[in-house]
Interface confidence: low
């Protein structure tokens, strides 16, 4: 139709200029479109350069939209992580503060001369919670062994207790149960509670990390072409008022985000496992009850040792022989005061319940994030047509869009009419992230069963640092405790000189 040749390019000029491009590129009136590489080759208001500029722009706009959606999800996960992390750390800090405030009065020198050992234990528990590759059972066993040696010496200042005698004491200890049931109870409960807390928080970290890394996956050239056709070809072909048909948009974005949709199954598994493990936050072996009450087990242990002192001493002498008397030493210590115990069951503050219920709701909301992404982006970012089916832009003209909507994921894109997808070449970054989701889900399932898991070597990029290695964001500001080579010397953290006065001030 010769009349169409003279159609003005005013609307395209307006849109093109608004994107920041030079208006000198835009023809005054439509020109023949044989030069077009992406848009249908009818009469057009777009030169080759304009088509290329708009293709690059549409690609960038989709990547921005994708990153924006990801950022919202990342922010939610980061907020959850911070809230839970703060709460769990607060519980442990509260327990340590209570210990520092009450043990000097309750146990006197039995505590003050060993304040470092207690502080080191809390340091180790913090490290363990934060994902350090510590074996909690061994850490606790070592703490009790050292504490027994030191307390036994303090309870018997009149005796000479050389290293070989203390080694013998250590060997007898398991059978004698000098601290009563406290070590066993603490070990069983603490392992379950800490592993549940740290795996849940780490799950949030891994989820956030996966979203961040996937958002950086570039969209391929075939996707760029399809998005250009979807968004700007209508303008080039002189139907600028026509908005994309909904099903057409979905097919384009399902093709573009085919690899991302393959995250769906493992993403759901991870979120399900995270929701499930929150069951372990309640009850007598629950996170709140245990982490906030470490000091009460320690108090029970010292009380038990004092109560059992005479029996223990007799059995140790029976098993290890009579130790030599220290001529310079004072007489045997008087029976020491019993430390008053705080109730072991902390009344729930309600904070954790609130955090968990919010987290469950939010995790459920984002379960279908990856497969709903094409639909979400189409409806929120692509200004879809709300007109009748035959009045929308179908990629060729204004009219009905006939092809069916493809399924989700890479394999289902084999016949996608809008984006040429090579289903034999999955994106490697996304495959790695699927692997990360699987690994974390397995950890959470192990944690649900109360099993400790190795939190090292989960990094997927081989760099040896970053948030894939079992640390909380950049809270990898931790290290495995410095154990000195001799089992007789105290744990040598470099902050051992916290005096009792300072210890009581900590808050």
């Amino acid at each position: 139709d010769p009349a169409s040749k003279s159609r003005s390019c005013g609307e395209v000029r307006q849109i093109y200029g608004a994107k920041g491009f030079s208006l000198s590129d835009v023809p005054q009136a439509e020109i023949s479109g044989e030069h077009l590489r992406i848009c249908p080759q009818g009469y057009t208001c777009c030169t080759s350069e304009m088509e290329e500029n708009l293709a690059n722009r549409s690609h960038a706009e989709l990547e921005t939209a994708l990153r924006d959606s990801s950022r919202v999800l990342q922010a939610m996960l980061a907020t959850q992580l911070r809230s839970f992390d703060d709460h769990f750390q607060h519980l442990l800090n509260d327990s340590e503060r209570t210990l520092q405030a009450t043990f000097p009065g309750a146990f006197g020198e039995l505590y003050t001369q060993n304040a470092r050992a207690f502080r080191d234990l809390y340091s180790e528990l913090r490290l363990y919670y934060r994902g350090a590759n510590l074996h909690l059972e061994e850490t606790l066993a070592e703490f009790w062994a050292r504490l027994l040696e030191r307390l036994f010496k303090q309870l018997h200042p009149q005796l000479l207790l050389p290293d070989d005698y203390l080694d013998c004491l250590g060997k007898q200890a398991e059978a004698l149960r000098p601290f009563g049931e406290a070590p066993r109870e603490l070990r069983l409960r603490a392992t379950r509670a800490f592993v549940a807390a740290r795996s849940f928080v780490q799950g949030l970290g891994v989820a956030s990390d996966v979203v961040r890394k996937v958002a950086q996956v570039p969209l391929g050239p075939e996707c760029s072409r399809a998005v250009m056709k979807l968004v700007y070809c209508a303008h080039c072909l002189g139907v600028p008022g026509a908005r994309p048909c909904p099903d057409y948009c979905r097919n384009v974005l399902k093709g573009c985000l085919a690899n991302q949709a393959d995250l769906d199954a493992e993403w759901r598994n991870l979120l399900d496992s995270m929701v499930l493990i929150t069951d372990k936050f309640w009850g007598t072996s629950g996170v709140e009850s245990v982490i906030g009450s470490v000091h009460t087990w320690l108090a029970e242990a010292i009380n038990a040792l004092q109560d059992n002192r005479d029996t223990l001493t007799a059995k140790v002498i029976q098993g290890c022989g009579n130790p030599k008397v220290n001529p310079q030493g004072p007489g045997p210590e008087e029976k020491r005061r019993r430390g008053k115990l705080a109730p072991r069951e902390r009344p729930p503050s309600g904070t954790l319940e609130k955090l968990v219920s919010e987290a469950k709701a939010q995790l459920r909301d984002v379960q279908d994030f990856w497969i709903s992404l094409p639909g979400t982006l189409c409806s929120e970012k692509m200004a879809l047509s709300t007109a009748s089916d035959d009045r929308c832009w179908n990629g060729m003209a204004r009219g009905r869009y006939l092809p069916e909507v493809m399924g989700d994921g890479l394999a289902n894109q084999i016949n996608n009419p809008e984006v040429e997808v090579d289903i034999t070449k999955p994106d490697m970054t996304i495959r790695q992230q699927i692997m990360q989701l699987k690994i974390m889900t397995n950890r959470l399932r192990s944690a649900y069963n109360g099993n400790d898991v190795d939190f090292q070597d989960a990094s997927d990029d081989g760099s040896g640092s970053g948030s894939g290695d079992g640390c909380l964001d950049d809270l990898c500001s931790r290290k495995v405790s410095r154990k000195s080579s001799s089992s007789r010397t105290p744990l040598t953290h470099a902050l051992p000189g916290l005096s009792e006065q300072e210890g009581q001030k900590t808050s």
Partner: antibody, heavy 123, light 104 residues
Framework: AVTLDESGGGLQTPGRALSLVCKAS????????MLWVRQAPGKGLEWVGV????????NYGAAVKGRATISRDNGQNTVRLQLNNLRAEDTATYYC?????????????????WGLGTEVIVS | ALTQPSSVSANPGETVKITCSGG????YGWYQQKSPGSALVTVI????KRPTDIPSRFSGSTSGSTGTLTITGVQAEDEAVYFC???????????FGAGTTLTV
Amino acid sequence: AVTLDESGGGLQTPGRALSLVCKASGFTFSNYDMLWVRQAPGKGLEWVGVISSSGSSTNYGAAVKGRATISRDNGQNTVRLQLNNLRAEDTATYYCAKSAYGYYGSGVSDIDAWGLGTEVIVS
Amino acid sequence: ALTQPSSVSANPGETVKITCSGGSGNNYGWYQQKSPGSALVTVIYDNNKRPTDIPSRFSGSTSGSTGTLTITGVQAEDEAVYFCGGYDSSTYADIFGAGTTLTV
């Protein structure tokens, strides 16, 4: 990049108090323990003290114990050293340092970054 | 204090080892200072960890209660005083060595 910027040095009067401030940037301040180290003219390094990441625990070297207080403001990314009852032997360049770790237990062997130092002369 | 040699000299390209002993926590850090009172740079912390901006020719190790700083293929710009830092459990204090002057 991690930067630590000390201020508050200069000429001080014996018997008075000194307050040095270290402003940190380029890292998540609240996650890391912070230390103060000093160097007297022509001498070696001397550990002054350390504060834990949360600010709840401190520890001091023998030469300043009882006179020094280290505090921190995690909102402002600052750590402060207050040294009372100044003596001539407190004359030194004072360095603020960041630990690579963030729990009660950081020592000088864990320092991974230093400030440029601020000179204090007690005379 | 920790014990370290007062001076060490080497030709460019040679390997230099500086030792530090006397710490009871078996943890050492190594710090470079090009002139007295000037900026300090950590070359090794926590025995063997190297800050990201430090060249790979610097490495650290610990054996028993002795820490060692190794500079493989020493360069002229490595000329400086190197202090080691560690911990003494008998005094509950963090301590430094007196410094080793490296001349290249």
